[in-house]
């Protein structure tokens, strides 16, 4: 059998391999050692017994999408049946005091590979033996502690494979410089050590994407905006736009990045080198926001100009696949730069909202029949912008951290936006009061510290804004 017979549904073409050469990966036309690494089709009954106590699940993730030329990283995590985990020596053990369907286990080990490797014979002086090899026959790398690595991972994409010895989690990074743009498929097969051979325990696949567009995300936030995710914002208050470039391999770290904004409100283009920008809309309505991100990134060098047509210059002929796989134009080994672009577009709605709220007066209400240890206080509040429909007060300790009381109530306010909010305080002392006015789209907050005196008729109320 060959690798493509084992790892994929269909034999990839040489064309695919030649056009997507991955550094350090091998052609899936290579032979697979089926004696050491048995191959089971989907639905084979042997899968049921490939792992003691249930099935192992492999979870494959990647930091896709990847900007072409950058590195994309794949991570495989093995999820063991309930109550099982990998210990420091790479053995699989039962978790202490964990009960699964089989109850508590007397044997602490699910797989005691340390014992197996110590019993193993047929080794030469280097600690290498005929079974410490990958499916293509290459020997395992002897990193320190490699004996504690009991899983073999075979990654397969674009007609090529990569083998890795590891523990219950491995990561592999691939440079995408030669990868065709668009969605691609990564498949991973995982084997576990089994005496002097290996047993398949899991297979997983995931789609990843290589793009020549910078992946761009924009977060939009605004003070007093009630719901930051509905793309509805308030007139006359600055909106903060924060651009996040998805670049997990730091490919663009040394690039100069320019942000070109069009806010859709006839304010023209705004060019910035800062990833954060503020903009205030002064009219209500719907606006089309456009962002273009430009970065000078490492990229392919243009081919040299072709030689003059006559006399024809001999060019190396294209040999069989593998000799000179691409017959490429000579690409100089220079550090060339190429402008990469990313785009973001959003439609945002601008509406009236409560822009500001202020407490302009605080008055102690003298009660005819004072309650035991209770004070009533009136807060006179003004606001700007739209008319609020509700008021909330949160009374907490002086640090404003421990809430003691929260009350919300509807309000009916005139155009002047002047209202009085009455609240009760239990006992004397200093309180933090958070007062918010809200409507459908906005929520405006103000805070104050007040001192409630003892119930002594001579005492007065103090407020510190």
């Amino acid at each position: 059998k060959r690798f493509h017979d084992v790892l994929g549904n269909e034999r990839p073409s040489a064309y695919m391999r030649e056009h997507n050469q991955l550094n350090g990966w091998s052609s899936d036309e290579n032979d697979w050692n089926e004696k050491l690494y048995p191959v089971w089709k989907r639905g084979d009954m042997r899968w049921k017994n490939s792992w003691k106590g249930g099935r192992v699940q492999a979870v494959l993730t990647s930091d896709s999408p990847a900007l072409v030329g950058s590195n994309i990283t794949f991570v495989v995590n093995l999820v063991f049946p309930r109550c099982q985990k990998e210990d420091a020596n790479g053995n699989i053990v039962y978790e202490k005091n964990c009960r699964n369907e089989a109850g508590l286990s007397a044997d602490p080990y699910v797989y005691n590979w340390t014992a197996w490797s110590e019993d193993s014979d047929g080794e030469n002086g280097t600690g290498q033996s005929h079974h410490n090899v990958f499916p293509d026959g290459k020997p395992f790398p002897h990193h320190p502690g490699w004996r504690r690595w009991n899983f073999v991972y075979v990654f397969h994409t674009l007609g090529q494979y990569f083998q890795k010895l590891g523990r219950c989690s491995v990561r592999v990074s691939v440079n995408t410089a030669n990868v065709t743009l668009g969605p691609q498929l990564m498949e991973v097969t995982v084997y576990r050590r089994h005496g002097r051979a290996y047993v398949p325990i899991a297979q997983v696949k995931d789609v990843y994407v290589v793009t020549d567009q910078i992946p761009v995300f924009v977060t939009m936030s605004q003070k007093n905006d009630r719901n930051s995710s509905d793309e509805t914002f308030l007139k006359d208050l600055p909106i903060t736009f924060d651009v996040l470039i998805h670049d997990p391999s730091h490919f663009l770290n040394y690039s100069t990045i320019n942000y070109k904004w069009s806010f859709g409100d006839n304010t023209g283009l705004f060019v910035s080198i800062n990833h954060t920008v503020n903009h205030t809309y002064v009219l209500n309505g719907t606006f089309s926001l456009n962002l273009t991100v430009k970065a000078a990134a490492p990229g392919p060098c243009p081919p040299p100009p072709p030689p003059p047509p006559r006399p024809p210059k001999p060019t190396p002929s294209l040999g069989p696949a593998g000799d000179n796989p691409l017959g490429l134009s000579e690409i100089p080994d220079e550090n060339c730069q190429i402008n990469r672009y990313g785009h973001f577009q959003a439609t945002i709605t601008i509406v009236e909202g409560i822009l500001e709220v202020n407490i302009i007066q605080t008055t102690d209400v003298l009660m005819l029949v004072p309650g035991p240890d209770s004070s009533l206080i009136d807060f006179v509040v003004t606001c700007q912008g739209s008319i609020p429909t509700e008021v909330c007060t949160i009374i907490s300790d002086p640090t404003c951290e421990i809430t003691q009381n929260a009350v919300c109530s509807p309000v009916d306010v005139d155009e002047m936006c002047l209202l009085t909010v009455r609240r009760a305080f239990n006992g004397s002392g200093t309180y933090c009061v958070n007062l918010t006015l809200g409507d459908d789209t906005s929520l405006a907050l103000t805070s104050t510290l007040i001192s409630v005196p003892d119930r002594d008729p001579a005492s007065s109320l103090r407020m510190a804004n």
């Epitope: 073409s13 064309y15 030649e18 743009l181 990229g299 243009p302 696949a321």
Partner: antibody, heavy 119, light 107 residues
Framework: QVQLVQSGAEVKKPGASVKVSCKAS????????MHWVRQAPGQGLEWMGE????????NYAQKFQGRVTMTVDKSTSTVYMELSSLRSEDTAVYYC????????????WGQGTLVTVSS | DIVMTQSPDSLAVSLGERATINCKTS??????LAWYQQKPGQPPKLLIY???KRYTGVPDRFSGSGSGTDFTLTISSLQAEDVAVYYC?????????FGGGTKVEIK
């Protein structure tokens, strides 16, 4: 929808050069290799070579090495095929064809450009 | 280079009858083989790719089969609009190659 529009017919003298253009639209131009295939009158199809618009890597059939040059203008999403030292047997319809991802089969073809080489 | 041998050169079949075209490659290209239909004055039209996968919009009377070095295009019930030249193409490796073509006519 994907469209490949080629330049018009050409009549050339032996020894001259011809440059045929193929303007692409309806897809991300840099994402797919573009190929050139020719067909002499009453004959079969013959693959000439390919170019990657993203990095301008080229790959030519041995028969055309040294005589063919494929180039790209990303700003106009256009691929060019120039064939030099023309001879009468180069009289043919020249097609551009777009491959599909990592697969070199052609679902999209230009309408063809007839190049006639005659003294 | 891979050599493509297509047979027969021409084929006359009655309307509604089955037409079978063969394509042999000099080395294993499985499953990277495509079939095209070409009518006079038009570019080729993709029918089948990867030996047996029918391209979008292609009538199901067209089917592809085969593996290794031997491949077949079958038109299960020939229609008048199927009169054309049919080409196979290996898309396994570069240089890409086409078969010599098979002309299908109505008997």
């Amino acid at each position: 929808q994907v469209q490949l529009v080629q330049s018009g017919a050409e009549v050339k003298k032996p020894g001259a050069s011809v440059k045929v253009s193929c303007k692409a639209s309806g897809y991300t131009f840099t994402s797919y290799w573009m190929h050139w295939v020719r067909q002499a009158p009453g004959q079969g199809l013959e693959w000439m070579g390919e170019i990657n618009p993203y990095d301008q890597r080229t790959n030519y059939a041995q028969k055309f090495q040294g005589r063919v040059t494929m180039t790209v203008d990303k700003s106009t999403s256009t691929v060019y095929m120039e064939l030099s030292s023309l001879r009468s047997e180069d009289t043919a319809v020249y097609y551009c064809a777009r491959s599909t991802g990592n697969y070199a089969w052609f679902a999209y073809w230009g309408q063809g450009t007839l190049v006639t080489v005659s003294s | 280079d891979i050599v493509m041998t297509q047979s027969p050169d021409s084929l006359a079949v009655s309307l509604g009858e089955r037409a079978t075209i063969n394509c042999k490659t000099s080395q294993d290209v499985s499953p990277s083989l495509a079939w095209y239909q070409q009518k006079p004055g038009q570019p080729p039209k993709l029918l089948i790719y990867s030996a047996s996968k029918r391209y979008t919009g292609v009538p199901d009377r067209f089917s592809g089969s085969g593996s290794g070095t031997d491949f077949t295009l079958t038109i299960s019930s020939l229609q008048a609009e199927d009169v054309a030249v049919y080409y196979c193409q290996q898309h396994y490796s570069i240089p890409l190659q086409f078969g010599g073509g098979t002309k299908v006519e109505i008997k």
